[in-house]
């Protein structure tokens, strides 16, 4: 995505108050937590905690909150310029190729195999062979040993699937 | 990922009225904003009127401003379009489309999902 000017980068006089609920239009653009009246002569705040926009836009609504699923822990609200950060629950992940849901992560190895990676809110334990190190991945045949997984701190954001 | 279907196209006289739906399949239809646009023969697309996720904001084209009515339910997960005072140029392929929010010139923003359009032909 290409560098947005952010609403610091404006002169002071540009600049929409906080409690501002219409603004007009820089350049034919609002700014972040804003959106663009239907005649394009208004910027319109955000509802917070209902909806947000992030950058400098000519959209005519704010996109909706994500709501945390349930298995879903939330890490921050949404503001009129973020959305909300949801992060898989301890104990569960989320792939890369089916970020909708969380996935309960393994809790141990299987036969031959031994534990390299804890279970982290984005990915799975991680197994490599006993003697050759090479990973392990997809489901448990059997479990060797149960592994108490521990959850990552960092946070990911949600997808605006919710 | 969503799935959407038109249906209320027709053949109506001028002056008459019709209503279009739209329904959606998949459970996130209250995320996304949703759009009619419109297609007259050998015409380009044209952006008719757009409504928000909670459906208390809209946008209508001039062209279709005080004529058109569009409103959805998001318990029946179906978007509308109330056409009234219709006229030989409103004839076209109407297409409801989903996205998460909407340009004033028509663009989508963000992931969005296409119907396959129905008729509306207006004439004596």
């Known amino acids: 995505e290409s560098a947005l000017i952010t609403q610091q980068d404006l002169a002071p006089q540009q600049r929409a108050a906080p409690q501002q609920k219409r603004s007009s239009p820089s350049e034919g653009l609002c700014p972040p937590g804003h959106h663009i009246s239907e005649d394009g002569r208004d910027c319109i705040s955000c509802k917070y905690g209902q909806d947000y926009s992030t950058h400098w836009n000519d959209l005519l609504f704010c996109l909706r909150c994500t709501r945390c699923d349930s298995g879903e822990v939330e890490l921050s609200p949404c503001t009129t310029t973020r959305n909300t950060v949801c992060q898989c629950e301890e104990g569960t992940f989320r792939e890369e190729d089916s970020p909708e849901m969380c996935r309960k992560c393994r809790t141990g190895c299987p036969r031959g195999m031994v534990k390299v990676g804890d279970c982290t809110p984005w990915s799975d334990i991680e197994c490599v062979h006993k003697e050759s190190g090479t990973k392990h991945s997809g489901e448990v045949p059997a479990v060797e040993e149960t592994v108490t997984s521990s959850p990552g701190t960092p946070a990911s954001p949600c997808s605006l699937s919710g | 990922e969503v799935q959407l279907l038109e249906s209320g196209g027709g053949e109506v006289q001028p002056g008459g009225s019709l209503r279009l739906s739209c329904a959606a399949s998949?459970?996130?239809?209250?995320?996304?904003?949703m759009s009619w646009f419109r297609q007259a023969p050998g015409k380009g697309l044209e952006f008719v009127s757009a409504?928000?996720?909670?459906?208390?904001?809209?946008y209508y084209a001039e062209s279709v401003k005080g004529r058109f009515t569009i409103s959805r339910d998001n318990a029946k997960n179906t978007l509308y379009l109330q056409m009234s005072s219709l006229r030989a140029e409103d004839t076209a392929v109407y297409y409801c489309?989903?996205?998460?929010?909407?340009?004033?010139?028509?663009?989508?923003?963000?992931?969005?999902?296409w119907g396959q359009g129905t008729l509306v032909t207006v004439k004596p």
């Open positions: 998949g459970r996130t239809f209250t995320n996304y904003a």
């Open positions: 409504i928000n996720w909670s459906g208390d904001s809209t």
């Open positions: 489309a989903s996205a998460e929010s909407f340009s004033r010139g028509g663009l989508p923003y963000g992931m969005n999902y």
